[in-house]
């Protein structure tokens, strides 16, 4: 029998190279069955992980899976960091692991994205 | 030339509502977010948020949240900020400005939209 | 919140002589620091971006410097049509945040 638990799916030590001034979409992949729970995300901060708080975050369905997705526009250099999903299920916490933002500092003008860049994010 | 053209000044009563207008020309409008500001009587700067005319995703200052709402239109090249329930602390002139990227930075500013909240 | 302090408030300058204006950041912003100019009635112009680019079309007396904390606007030798607020901003980090600016004044 397929458990009911939700389940989120960010694989452990994985990451994303990005650059400032762009935009960005941080996904959560979330399995649940009947209800889906209250997701949060939140930045880590040395061993504690910050809450963040009115950011902007959609969901986006596919299939058998949901995405909670944390919005950047655009990415500013101190986003830079690891940042966990959390789901409040039954009144217990499920996290997620640790997803890291490595963003570069892009500073020559002439380093910016190409026309469709930004269109194709 | 790249313009940003603003609505007109806007007088209104404490309690009512705007949308400031902001029309993009002379570049790709889809190529840059758009950024507003207020300044109030002349003095500091304020960010109110920034849109990506592509998909109308917004980051907001958390003082303004709530406050003003910015929208695009992508048809016309415009984009808008709705500004609801005024009081006179909201009485100030906005600016729109487009965002240069990596770093982002302000690198063409409308001529301001000049808000007069007074009974 | 980081907060950008611009000092002096005011000064005045006679034409030909060198200005140096500060901006101090409450914590490091590396160098996503901006400089806008803004002549009286009008809006903001852009002249420096990543704390030293000038930008297109600025006269090369604006030079921008500082990395971290601190940043300065000199101008090499003031004009008339220099007389304007100074403000400068950060993006480095959300809220992105403006100092008081500095308005330079002709004697």
């Known amino acids: 029998k397929e458990s009911c638990d939700v389940q989120l799916y960010i694989k452990r030590q994985s990451y994303h190279s990005i650059f400032a001034g762009d935009p960005f979409k941080l996904e959560c992949p979330v399995k649940y069955c009947a209800h889906r729970p209250q997701v949060t995300w939140c930045k880590l901060n040395g061993t504690t992980c910050v809450k963040l708080e009115g950011r902007h975050t959609s969901w986006k369905q596919e299939k058998n899976l949901s995405f909670f997705i944390l919005h950047f526009e655009p990415v500013l250099p101190s986003d830079n960091g690891s940042y966990r999903c959390s789901a409040n299920f039954l009144s217990a916490i499920i996290e997620s692991h640790s997803t890291t933002l490595y963003v570069t500092d892009v500073k020559s003008a002439s380093e910016r994205p190409s026309k469709d860049e930004m269109a194709s994010r | 030339e790249v313009q940003l053209q603003q609505s007109g000044p806007e007088l209104v009563q404490p309690g009512a509502s705007v949308k400031i207008s902001c029309k993009a020309s002379?570049?790709?409008?889809?190529?840059?977010?758009m950024i507003w500001v207020k300044q109030s009587h002349g003095k500091s700067l304020e960010w109110i948020g920034n849109?990506?005319?592509?998909?109308?995703?917004?980051t907001y200052n958390q003082k303004f949240k709530g406050k003003a709402t910015l929208t695009v239109d992508k048809s016309s090249s415009t984009a808008y900020m709705g500004l609801p329930s005024l009081t006179s602390e909201d009485s100030a002139v906005y600016y729109c400005a487009r965002g240069g990227l990596r770093p982002l930075y302000f690198d063409y500013w409308g001529q301001g939209t000049t808000l007069t909240v007074s009974s | 919140n980081i907060v950008m302090t611009q000092s002096p408030k005011s000064m005045s300058m006679s034409v030909g002589e060198r200005v140096t204006l500060s901006c101090k950041a409450s914590e490091n912003v590396d160098t996503y620091v901006s400089w806008y100019q803004q002549k009286p009635e009008q809006s903001p112009k852009l002249l420096i971006y990543?704390?030293?680019n000038r930008y297109t079309g600025v006269p090369d007396r604006f030079t921008g410097s500082g990395s971290a904390t601190d940043f300065t606007l000199t101008i090499s030798s003031v004009q008339a049509e220099d007389l304007a607020d100074y403000h400068c901003g950060q993006s480095y980090s959300y809220p992105l945040t403006f100092g008081a600016g500095t308005k330079l004044e002709l004697i």
């Open positions: 990543g704390a030293s």
């Open positions: 849109i990506n005319p592509n998909n109308g995703g917004t």
């Open positions: 002379g570049y790709t409008f889809t190529d840059y977010y």
